[in-house]
Each structure stands twice: as structure tokens, then as C-alpha cells.
């Protein structure tokens, strides 16, 4: 099943997020991803957990998953590099770098997103954009077109309350509000963008969606700058 959803969001402006990628398994959307370099897409490590026997590809330049669009192109994956410390049973280090079979053809609808290198927290209350092709309601409806939602960042202390994520949110993770509007499993690997810069990647741990006491969890890319740079080098 696809890992994720944008709950309570709205349809994104077509091709206004040219960094947005759909990580696909056997031709179907599995996870979100974000183009961070001409030949590299950043996603979540857990996305490929069940993909051992399938064909993983990356769709770039898409708004609709099904309709023909001039900018759309499906790339094979040359190499999949999960973070070495990622594990199936934790949300920590949930990052994956996918090397495309060739450099992406860049244009207005396909362009890498600058990512945050300064290792500091996003200030609570800052509004950040998260986008994806995940399920849009609790009935499980999957959208054909890219959805997005603007969410306020939540402070770590609140997110770590016993009633919320009970201490699971390390300094390498961040949270955003989840009151009826949320990212969720199937949006895993997708980007959390604050002020036009990639700050977080949707984690793919299982959690209830759209419940304000279970905020969305995102991996802070700045905390992994050294690893990203070493893989991209």
C-alpha cells in the first residue's frame, strides 16, 4: 500500500513544486521524495522496506499521477542508499537517497530544492509547506493530483509530552501540528519546506493521522548534512 497522505489539505498549484518526486514501486505511487541534486532524490528509508522484489522508480515533473504531462518523466534508480543507522522498528534516521539512472532533465517543472545546512531548530509557530500524493481522507481516497498543506511547527517539548510522542522526538526530528490537517504514512519521504528551503522529510513510522495529540514527525535534514554530502559527493 502507498505510504502516506496529505489530510485536510488542498490541491497544489500544478508544477509549482518542481522538486517534488513520486517514489514508485512497480509503477504505483509508494512515497514522496524531493529532488536535492540533479541525480539524487531524498526520501524516507522505511519506504523501501517492503520493496525488495519490486522495481523502484522515481517520477519527476508530475502534478497528476495518471494524466500525460509534457514535463513528466520516470527515472530508473541506479542506487538506493538508506541511512546506515535506519532500522525497521524506529523512526530515527529515516532517510533514503536515491541515485537516478541519469541526471534529471531540469526545467520549470523539474528543479532541485535548496536544503537546510544550518543545524538549528525551526522556530515554533513557523508555517511550513508539506506536499504529497497520499490518501486525502480517512476513507482512504487517493488523489491523482499533488496535494499540499501549510502547517505550523510545534515545539519539541510539547511534541514529547507523554500524551503526544512521549519522548520519542530527538534533536534530529521535528514536529508539526496535526489537528485535522496532517501528513501521514503514505506521504513519507516528502518535503517539509519552510521559507522556500527544505527543512524536513516526512517520516514513515506508523501513527494515527489528523489527531492533534499525535503531531506529524519530520526528519531534520540539517542534522544529516554530513551524511547527505558524503553520499552525493
Amino acid at each position: 500500500p502507498p505510504r502516506g497522505r496529505i489530510l485536510g489539505g488542498r490541491e497544489a498549484e500544478a508544477h509549482a513544486r518542481p522538486y517534488m518526486a513520486s517514489v514508485q514501486l512497480n509503477g504505483a505511487h509508494l512515497c514522496g521524495g524531493v529532488l536535492v541534486a540533479e541525480q539524487w532524490v531524498l526520501s524516507a528509508a522505511h519506504c523501501l522496506e517492503d520493496a525488495a522484489d519490486g522495481k523502484v522508480q522515481v517520477l519527476l515533473g508530475a502534478h497528476s499521477l495518471s494524466q500525460p504531462e509534457p514535463s513528466k518523466r520516470l527515472y530508473d534508480v541506479l542506487r538506493a542508499v538508506p541511512h546506515p543507522d535506519s532500522q525497521p522498528d524506529t523512526i530515527d534516521h529515516d532517510l533514503l537517497l536515491l541515485q537516478l539512472s541519469e541526471k534529471a532533465t531540469l526545467g520549470p517543472a523539474v528543479r532541485p530544492l535548496p536544503w537546510q545546512r544550518v543545524d538549528r531548530d525551526v522556530a515554533p509557530g513557523t508555517l511550513c509547506d508539506v506536499a504529497g500524493w497520499g490518501i486525502v481522507n480517512h476513507a482512504g481516497r487517493r488523489p491523482d493530483s499533488l496535494q499540499h498543506v501549510l502547517l505550523p511547527v510545534l515545539d519539541r517539548a510539547t511534541c514529547n509530552r507523554r500524551t503526544h510522542h512521549d519522548g520519542a522526538i530527538t534533536e534530529r526530528l521535528m514536529c508539526a501540528e496535526s489537528n485535522r490537517r496532517d501528513s501521514c504514512k503514505g506521504d513519507s519521504g516528502g518535503p517539509l519546506v519552510c521559507g522556500g528551503v527544505l527543512e524536513g522529510v516526512v517520516t514513515s513510522g506508523s501513527r494515527v493521522c489528523g489527531n492533534r495529540k499525535k503531531p506529524g514527525i519530520y526528519t531534520r535534514v540539517a542534522s544529516y548534512a554530513a551524511w547527505i554530502d558524503s553520499v552525493l559527493a
Epitope: E13, A16, A123, L127, D129, L150, P152, R180, G195, G196
Partner: antibody
Framework: QVQLQQSGPELVKPGASVKISCKAS????????INWVKQRPGQGLEWIGW????????YYNEKFKGKATLTVDKSSSTAYMLLSSLTSEDSAVYFC??????????????WGQGTSVTVSS | DIQMTQSPASLSVSVGETVTITCRAS??????LAWYQQKQGKSPQLLVY???NLADGVPSRFSGSGSGTQYSLKINSLQSEDFGNYYC?????????FGGGTKLEMR
């Protein structure tokens, strides 16, 4: 076109409360944050807080917690701000304003015309 | 809370001149800043968002720049309709505070 139409001027007594409204039209009301901003006569602007009509989520400036309460009525596409325990310090023009989307960015792009609140005995 | 210090507080200029208004944040706000113009008795109007992006319908003589804690709004070849008050506002964490304003007056 996007419009935010605010209620008319209010003259209220110290200690009383007042509820001002902001009726939205020309866009999907539940999809956009509504901010409230205070401007004292001849002074600058102060951010009071925002509400997201789709969920009712609110964020307040600590300074206005207990003073301002933000609500919405989705059926009429109207945002409200209740100001309580009014003093002369609350005499000001209050603006509602929408946060709009620009690709993955956002900005407070449309403003109401303002509602003047005068607190006087 | 992040403080926004705007300067100058007032500026007396002539039509055709170029002016620069600055806004300094008490800490890094990572370009999460907007500029507004407000005429007497009117609502503020968005000019620039995320430090450098010109809002729809804003003349190209306006431009925003800056990063970190220092931001500027530049108006080239000032027109008569540009006189009024200008405010910056940050969006890096709540509360989204405004600068104290700059009053642009005709000399």
C-alpha cells in the same frame, strides 16, 4: 475577487466585551489562515494571532492571550475576534488578513478594511 | 520574542529619488520576512514576501533583499503614490512581530 469585509466601528464601555467580524468571499474560506492585527492610533502594527478555519486551530501572541478569542463560522465564511475586559489600551483599529499561498511560500496578502474600536465611558 | 528594528523611523524625500529602508531582526529569521505599505486610513498592502519575492501587481521599482538578520526594501525612482508608511514583519516563529515602521514623506 478575494475580499475581507469587516464589521463597523464600535464604541464600548470599559470592562465590556466586543465581537468584531470579518466576512470572507472570493476564495475557499476553510483553506486559508486568517490573521488579526491591532493598530493603535498613530502607532505601528501588532500581530494578535491566527486561526485556521478548516480545523479551528489557533495561535496567539502571548500578549493577547486572555484578551482576544478567535473563532470562525464556516457556514457563513466569517471569522470573529472577541475582545474582553476592555480598557482604553484596547482602543485601536483591528484588521483581519488572509495568509495566501505562493507555490511553497506564503504571505499575508489580503486585508480587511479595519474595524475601529473605541473604549470610553 | 524576536524584535524587529526598522530604520529610519522617517524619511523626507523627493519624487525620483531612490530610498532604502532597513529592518534588523534580533536573531536570524532565515528570510521569513515581508514588507507592507500603508497609506493613511487604509489597510496595509503586501509588497514583498519571503524577503525578495515581489507580490502580484507591485511595480518593479520595489525590491527586497537581505538574509540572516538584515533586510532591506529599496524603492527606485520614487513616485508620488509611494509616500506613506512601510512596515516589515517576520514569520520565523510566533509571534510574527512587525517593525516599528518608516514614514516616507514628501520633501
Amino acid at each position: 475577487q478575494v475580499q475581507l469585509q469587516q464589521s463597523g466601528p464600535e464604541l464600548v464601555k470599559p470592562g465590556a466585551s466586543v465581537k468584531i467580524s470579518c466576512k470572507a468571499s472570493g476564495y475557499s474560506f476553510t483553506d486559508y489562515y486568517i490573521n488579526w492585527v491591532k493598530q493603535r492610533p498613530g502607532q505601528g502594527l501588532e500581530w494578535i494571532g491566527w486561526i485556521f478555519p478548516g480545523s479551528g486551530s489557533t495561535y496567539y501572541n502571548e500578549k493577547f492571550k486572555g484578551k482576544a478569542t478567535l473563532t470562525v463560522d464556516k457556514s457563513s465564511s466569517t471569522a470573529y475576534m472577541l475582545l474582553s475586559s476592555l480598557t482604553s489600551e484596547d482602543s485601536a483599529v483591528y484588521f483581519c488578513a488572509r495568509t495566501g499561498y505562493y507555490s511553497n511560500l506564503y504571505a499575508v496578502d489580503y486585508w480587511g478594511q479595519g474595524t475601529s474600536v473605541t473604549v470610553s465611558s | 520574542d524576536i524584535q524587529m528594528t526598522q530604520s529610519p523611523a522617517s524619511l523626507s524625500v523627493s519624487v525620483g529619488e531612490t530610498v532604502t529602508i532597513t529592518c534588523r531582526a534580533s536573531e536570524n529569521i532565515y528570510s521569513n520576512l515581508a514588507w507592507y505599505q500603508q497609506k493613511q486610513g487604509k489597510s496595509p498592502q503586501l509588497l514583498v514576501y519571503v524577503a525578495t519575492n515581489l507580490a502580484d501587481g507591485v511595480p518593479s521599482r520595489f525590491s527586497g533583499s537581505g538574509s540572516g538578520t538584515q533586510y532591506s526594501l529599496k524603492i527606485n525612482s520614487l513616485q508620488s503614490e509611494d509616500f506613506g508608511n512601510y512596515y516589515c514583519q517576520h514569520f520565523w516563529g510566533t509571534p510574527y512581530t512587525f517593525g516599528g515602521g518608516t514614514k516616507l514623506e514628501m520633501r
